[in-house]
């Protein structure tokens, strides 16, 4: 969480941003809130990206003002216009690109004053893993697959029964480049699996951490997975 003032002079308002990550090819949100104003026409929102010539987005007098927008963001940005009046200046970024990573500034002007806060935005690819029993294998084997990751993640297996055990000798992980030549499909195979045990396939890079669990008993198979974005700090 980053809370910014940083405006010289007397009248400053509080602006708050949250560091976040974007999944390339999907839509992302750059979060920013501020002390609201009574009149929408008095609110100006400017989004800037450090090092970029034009603005990322500008909203003033109740509508988008995109004449100064940098071409790398053309047609890809929107604020939540109906929520500006209550202090939401968050930006929706469509079709996130790797090059969208960087430091952004949410700059607010209202009748009460001015304020800004910076936001670190990371970009990459992350997806939920699915763990299945590989019935084609000669021994009891688990197969963990996740369709899109970037940068290349690490894959670690763990088990509930053998806590702390190192499965690197009995597992094999491969990364297959997807058709767009950036993201990769992650496949990890775990051999010599025992029944009545819960196994976890943990995939992690500097943007996200995802876990796929599987519990194999003689009567059923239970699966669960979750994904967590790393470094979501507010400013």
């Amino acid at each position: 969480l980053i809370i910014g003032f940083g405006i010289s002079g007397r009248h400053s308002i509080t602006v708050t941003t949250v560091a976040s990550a974007g999944n390339i090819g999907e839509d992302g949100i750059l979060s920013c809130t501020f002390e609201p104003d009574i009149k929408l026409s008095d609110i100006v929102i400017q989004w800037l990206k450090e090092g970029v010539l034009g603005l990322v987005h500008e909203f003033k007098e109740g509508k988008d003002e995109l004449s100064e927008q940098d071409e790398m963001f053309r047609g890809r940005t929107a604020v939540f216009a109906d929520q500006v009046i209550v202090g939401n200046a968050s930006l929706r970024l469509k079709n996130v690109q790797l090059t969208d990573a960087g430091t952004y500034k949410c700059y607010i002007i209202t009748s009460k004053g001015k304020g800004n806060a910076n936001l670190e935005y990371k970009t990459g690819a992350f997806s939920m893993p699915e763990v299945n029993v590989d019935y084609n294998a000669s021994s009891e084997t688990l197969r963990c697959e996740a369709p899109r990751w970037f940068p290349q993640p690490t894959v670690v297996w763990a088990s509930q029964v053998d806590q702390g055990a190192n499965f690197s000798e009995v597992s094999n992980t491969s990364f297959e480049l997807n058709s767009e030549n950036v993201t990769m499909k992650v496949v990890s195979v775990l051999y010599n699996v025992t029944i009545n045990n819960t196994y976890s396939c943990m995939i992690e890079n500097d943007i996200a951490k995802a876990t796929g669990d599987i519990k194999v008993t003689e009567s059923e198979i239970k699966r669960r997975s979750h994904l967590q974005l790393l470094n979501s700090k507010a400013s």
Epitope: V44, Q46, L48, E50, V52, M72, G102, Y107
Partner: antibody
Framework: EVQLLESGGGLVKPGGSLRLSCAAS????????MHWVRQAPGKGLEWVAV????????YYADSVKGRFTISRDDSKNTLYLQMNSLKTEDTAVYYC??????????WGQGTLVTVSS | DIQMTQSPSSLSASVGDRVTITCRAS??????LNWYQQKPGKAPKLLIY???SLQGGVPSRFSGSGSGTDFTLTISSLQPEDFATYYC?????????FGGGTKVEIK
């Protein structure tokens, strides 16, 4: 430490050419638009040219358009200014500057270009 | 092109004085205005960006205000190291343009 270091200045005759370099260090050069700004002896600041972070856009002051070319080599973290058909009025200290939040936030120490016969 | 007019072109002041420099744009530039300080033989240094945002490491005695066409740089209490030339610069459209400068001298 974030740093910009210009080189390549010197004495050149009118109509001659010169290439200025600006070596960047301490930051991710490829993420920033970069500018050249000049200052004639005893005069104010004059913006010369800019190149976008990815090199796709370049803009020039009217006074140098068609004669100067701005370029960058991200693999070498270096900005360039190729100056052709130099005139006496191009005599100045040339600064490279990083584009931060809509401003020149980091400047080099400058390199002197003298155009004289 | 957008013309930037700074006034005064020079001023004499004493340590501790409050100093105000103004900058006028020939057309509306919103808040897209920056202020720089330059000392003899040195490169300029960014003080204020986006009209009123203080650049990191710049003392809080410097402040900027204004929007549209009229802008002000204020030094609340002039220090010996503040004697220099100050420039405003518009950042809304190419070509980027600077004001003519204001030289702050010791009285």
């Amino acid at each position: 430490e974030v740093q910009l270091l210009e080189s390549g200045g010197g004495l050149v005759k009118p109509g001659g050419s010169l290439r200025l370099s600006c070596a960047a260090s301490g930051f991710t050069f490829s993420s920033y638009a970069m500018h050249w700004v000049r200052q004639a002896p005893g005069k104010g600041l004059e913006w010369v040219a800019v190149i976008s972070y990815d090199g796709s856009n370049k803009y020039y002051a009217d006074s140098v358009k068609g004669r100067f070319t701005i370029s960058r080599d991200d693999s070498k973290n270096t900005l360039y200014l190729q100056m052709n058909s130099l005139k006496t009025e191009d005599t100045a200290v040339y600064y490279c500057a990083r584009h931060g939040w809509d401003a020149f936030d980091i400047w080099g120490q400058g390199t002197l270009v003298t155009v004289s016969s | 092109d957008i013309q930037m007019t700074q006034s005064p072109s020079s001023l004499s002041a004493s340590v501790g004085d409050r100093v105000t420099i103004t900058c006028r744009a020939s057309q509306d530039i919103s808040n897209r205005l920056n202020w720089y300080q330059q000392k003899p033989g040195k490169a300029p240094k960014l003080l204020i960006y986006l009209a009123s945002s203080l650049q990191g490491g710049v003392p809080s005695r410097f402040s900027g205000s204004g929007s549209g066409t009229d802008f002000t740089l204020t030094i609340s209490s002039l220090q010996p190291e503040d004697f220099a030339t100050y420039y405003c610069q518009q950042a809304i459209s190419f070509p980027l343009t600077f004001g003519g400068g204001t030289k702050v001298e010791i009285k």
